[in-house]
């Protein structure tokens, strides 16, 4: 139940993580203007990593996308780059997770198979949380870098009358909701990994390979946490085929990657 | 079309107050700013401030503000300016005019005359 | 606050001849952003309200006739009458359209000579 749960949870926190990334993604507040010089501008500026909003005081918002590729600065590539990257491993380790919940049931799938299912989901939402928090967090530094290349700027060459205002720019929404989304969708991620580790049946903590006795029909079993308990009752290969719903002290004689000896 | 049509002249004595209309038809009231600008007599124009009816947000010139009051009836698609504590200075014409792209004025009304005397 | 400062204040020309009426901000009313000038030209003719004529620095309103122009740009904006008319009589006002309080020039007179 506690497995069921946890991978349940893990999926709806990468869910909602990786809505939070593409919506990070899709959002023209990345960078807004700095109003600390000039709180009173009629003219608001903000960006996005797609194009580049001027809003009015008189309501009236323009945007213009970035038709160019080549000449956008290499940051802003890199930053999309890992968004995307992070879209699509999130959308790929949703798809993944999908038929990994132990909830849902498709056909007579193992629970070896979902457990390899969830832990692949779990690593594609870990990785895909990075790539939007080192995509972010790559802005934010740009960000950081500019305004105070824009602030030396400022305050040289005010030595005439004519005092010209340069527009500086802060963090937008966009980098808080993609820090959130990150951290949720790797979040979500560890749920998954360690959902897995109980995804496999309880046996494969301590049996990796049952051990027959030449002439005997008794199978060799090596002591651990389960044996100690009085429970060991099931001492026959017996392997249970109920479409993959198995209880917790049912053998799996099969070897497996995440048999943990 | 759009038309701004302002409340008639005013004759006010000092320290009294006075209460402005402006008349919005042709266009959705609630989703512009409602300007208002002074011009005194032989002068140029002031900027006195700004009204959104939609929420009730204003924003005042300095030089006004304390004294000036904007409000806006959505219902009736009309926005009010009102002058308190009224002095000689105060006498002027009052517009009122639209708040468009670009940050202009692009429909005004025909002007209020306002006259503080003793 | 910005400062507008028109020039001159009254300017005389002939019929069919141009007239040129400067405005200089005290601060840049250039936006980065989309790379446009928050300067705006009003005409004010007598007993009338002022009427839009350019915005954006050099945007014709609809229905301006195209003998009126806007140049500059930062804080040295012109406004240009190619062939002056009759009815072009007026007095010419600049506006600050980048910065609270929206200001505005002292006004330029334009006379036929």
């Known amino acids: 139940m506690a497995v069921t749960a946890c991978q349940g949870l893990g999926f709806v926190v990468s869910l909602i993580g990786i809505a939070g990334i593409i919506a990070a993604t899709c959002m023209d507040q990345w960078s807004t203007q700095d109003l600390y010089n000039n709180p009173v501008t009629a003219v608001f500026n903000y960006q996005g990593l797609w194009r580049s909003c001027v809003r009015e005081s008189s309501g009236f918002t323009e945007c213009r996308g970035y038709f160019t590729l080549l000449g956008l600065p290499a940051m802003l590539q890199a930053v999309r780059a890992l968004m995307i990257v992070g879209i699509v491993l999130g959308a790929i380790g949703l798809l993944v997770s999908i038929f990994a919940l132990k909830c849902i049931r498709i056909g007579s799938m193992e629970d070896s198979a979902k457990a390899n299912m969830t832990l692949t989901s779990g690593i594609m939402f870990i990785v895909s949380g990075l790539c939007a928090i080192a995509g972010v967090s790559v802005f934010a530094n740009m960000l950081v870098t500019n305004f105070w290349m824009s602030t030396a700027n400022m305050y040289t060459g005010m030595g005439g009358m004519v005092q010209t205002v340069q527009t500086r720019y802060t963090f937008g929404a966009a980098l808080f909701v993609g820090w959130v989304a990150g951290g949720l969708t790797l979040i979500g991620g560890v749920m998954m990994c360690i959902a897995c580790r109980g995804l496999a049946p309880e046996e494969t903590n301590y049996k990796a390979v049952s051990y027959h006795a030449s002439g005997h029909s008794v199978a060799y079993k090596p002591g651990g946490f389960k044996a100690s308990t009085g429970f060991g009752s099931n001492t026959k290969n017996k392997k249970i085929y109920d479409g993959g719903a198995r209880t917790e002290d049912e053998v799996q004689s099969y070897p497996s990657k995440h048999d943990y000896v | 079309q759009v038309q701004l049509v302002q409340s008639g002249a005013e004759v006010k004595k000092p320290g009294a107050s006075v209460k402005v209309s402006c008349k919005a038809s042709g266009y959705a009231f609630s989703n512009y700013w409602m300007n208002w600008v002074k011009q005194a007599p032989g002068q140029g124009l002031e900027w006195i401030g700004q009204?959104?009816?939609?929420?009730?947000?204003?924003k005042y010139n300095g030089n006004f503000k304390g004294r000036v009051t904007l409000t806006a009836d959505t219902s009736a698609s009309t926005a009010y300016m009102e002058l308190s504590s009224l002095r000689s200075e105060d006498t002027a014409v009052y517009f009122c005019?639209?708040?468009?792209?670009?940050?202009?004025?692009?429909?005004w009304g025909q002007g209020t005359l306002v006259t503080v005397s003793s | 606050d910005i400062v507008m400062t028109q020039s001159p204040d009254s300017l005389a020309v002939s019929l069919g001849e141009r007239a040129t009426i400067n405005c200089k901000s005290s601060?840049?009313?250039?936006?980065?952003?989309?790379?446009?000038?928050?300067l705006t030209w009003y005409q004010q003719k007598p007993g009338q309200p002022p009427k839009l004529l350019i915005y954006?620095?050099?945007t014709r309103d609809s229905g301006v006739p195209d003998r009126f122009s806007g140049s500059g740009s930062g804080t040295d904006f012109t406004l240009t009458i190619s062939s002056l008319q009759a009815e072009d009589v007026a007095v010419y006002y600049c506006q600050n359209a980048y910065t609270y309080p929206l200001t505005f020039g002292g006004g330029t007179k334009v006379e036929i000579k």
């Open positions: 005019a639209r708040y468009y792209r670009g940050n202009c004025f692009d429909y």
């Open positions: 601060q840049s009313l250039l936006n980065s952003g989309n790379q446009k000038n928050y």
């Open positions: 954006w620095a050099s």
């Open positions: 009204i959104y009816p939609g929420n009730g947000d204003t």
